[in-house]
């Protein structure tokens, strides 16, 4: 099969303030071995939103069980969305390395926009 692709199937997602936002991401292959991370923004100033390998991300839950063998779905849900969460989110696959994992491939990004909370 072809080399791994990182697929973010939605270009944009719009969520009302206070709701949860689901950001979808899938891989097409289990190879190479290594974790995935979610970032808001791109480049040096990007903000880490979720790291599959380590860290505490209280507002983030994974849609499927990432520890499940052969899992390829790395979608996340972010709770209690506020206007400050607006931006473009990237799902990024890393290749296992020593001492550090190496960025392998990024999805095309999903733009999250936040609507005013319904009155």
């Amino acid at each position: 099969e072809d080399e791994l692709q990182v697929i973010q199937p939605e270009k944009s997602v719009s969520v009302a303030a206070g709701e949860s936002a689901t950001l979808r991401c899938a891989m097409t292959s289990l190879i190479p071995v290594g974790p995935i991370m979610w970032f808001r923004g791109a480049g040096a100033g990007r903000e880490l939103i979720y790291n599959q390998k380590e860290g505490h991300f209280p507002r983030v839950t994974t849609v499927s069980e990432l520890t499940k063998r052969n899992n390829l779905d790395f979608s996340i849900s972010i709770s209690n969305i506020t206007p400050a969460d607006a931006g473009t989110y990237y799902c990024v696959k890393f290749r296992k390395g020593s001492p550090d994992d190496v960025e392998f491939k990024s999805g095309a990004g999903t733009e999250l926009s936040v609507r005013a909370k319904p009155s």
């Epitope: 939605e10 944009s12 899938a26 499927s64 052969n70 390829l72």
Partner: antibody, heavy 121, light 110 residues
């Protein structure tokens, strides 16, 4: 080479049931969602139902909800469509299709040759 | 629903554009990608030409290209061949429900 081979099409009467099968080969079956798409005579394409490869989540078009059931046997690389309470408007060629992602019904990069279901009294 | 013209025609060797508009999500600001399928005859298996708006499978000739602006996607065939005479369906999807197709555009090569 990816291959999708459908079977089970037949002529049935309204209200009867039928089960379609699709044997897949040439790719890692569990890594991809699968769907059924149909085409009535002289008409366009209609997505019918899909099933995720990651957790067996199922999806249905409103026109078949409650009557059709999609399932998959990953050990046999086989996709099924159980069709109950068939109607004349279900008459179509049914295509088994492979999705390009694991979890959703997005783009269908491989199609079977189709199997014809005719519902007629 | 997706809206596309019922028919278009093109001269052999010419260029033709087929447009498709609509889809899921345009009301609330969410949006998905578009794709295109070719069906050479009724009842024959469709073939994917374009997916993720502009990606072309490796076995599809480079004369087929896709582009999307807002909620309108366009399939362009540059240097139309006789064998391109077919019905072309656009498609999109909603990840929480399913896929949808346009009604199809018949291309006639003159």
């Amino acid at each position: 080479d990816v291959q999708l081979v459908e079977s089970g099409g037949a002529v049935v009467r309204p209200g009867e049931s039928l089960r379609l099968s699709c044997k897949a080969s040439g790719f890692t079956f569990t890594n991809f969602a699968m769907s059924w798409v149909r085409q009535a005579p002289g008409e366009g394409l209609e997505w019918v139902s899909g099933i995720s490869g990651s957790d067996d989540t199922t999806y249905y078009a409103d026109s078949v909800k409650g009557r059709f059931t999609i399932s998959r046997d990953n050990s046999e690389s086989t996709l099924y469509l159980q069709m109950n309470s068939l109607r004349a408007e279900d008459t179509a060629v049914y295509y088994c299709v492979k999705d390009s992602t694991v979890s959703w019904n997005t783009f269908f990069d491989y199609w079977g040759l189709g199997t014809l279901v005719t519902v007629s009294s | 629903a997706l809206t596309q013209p019922a028919s278009v025609s093109a001269n052999l060797g010419g260029t033709v554009k087929i447009t498709c508009s609509g889809g899921y999500g345009s009301d609330d600001g969410s949006s998905s990608y578009y794709g295109w399928y070719q069906q050479k005859s009724p009842g024959s298996a469709p073939v994917i030409l374009i997916y993720w708006d502009d990606k072309r499978p490796s076995d599809i000739p480079s004369r087929f290209s896709g582009s999307t602006s807002g909620s309108t996607t366009t399939l362009t065939i540059t240097g139309v061949q006789a064998e391109d005479e077919a019905v072309y369906f656009c498609g999109t999807y909603d990840t929480s429900s399913g896929a949808i197709f346009g009604a199809g555009t018949t291309l006639t090569v003159l």
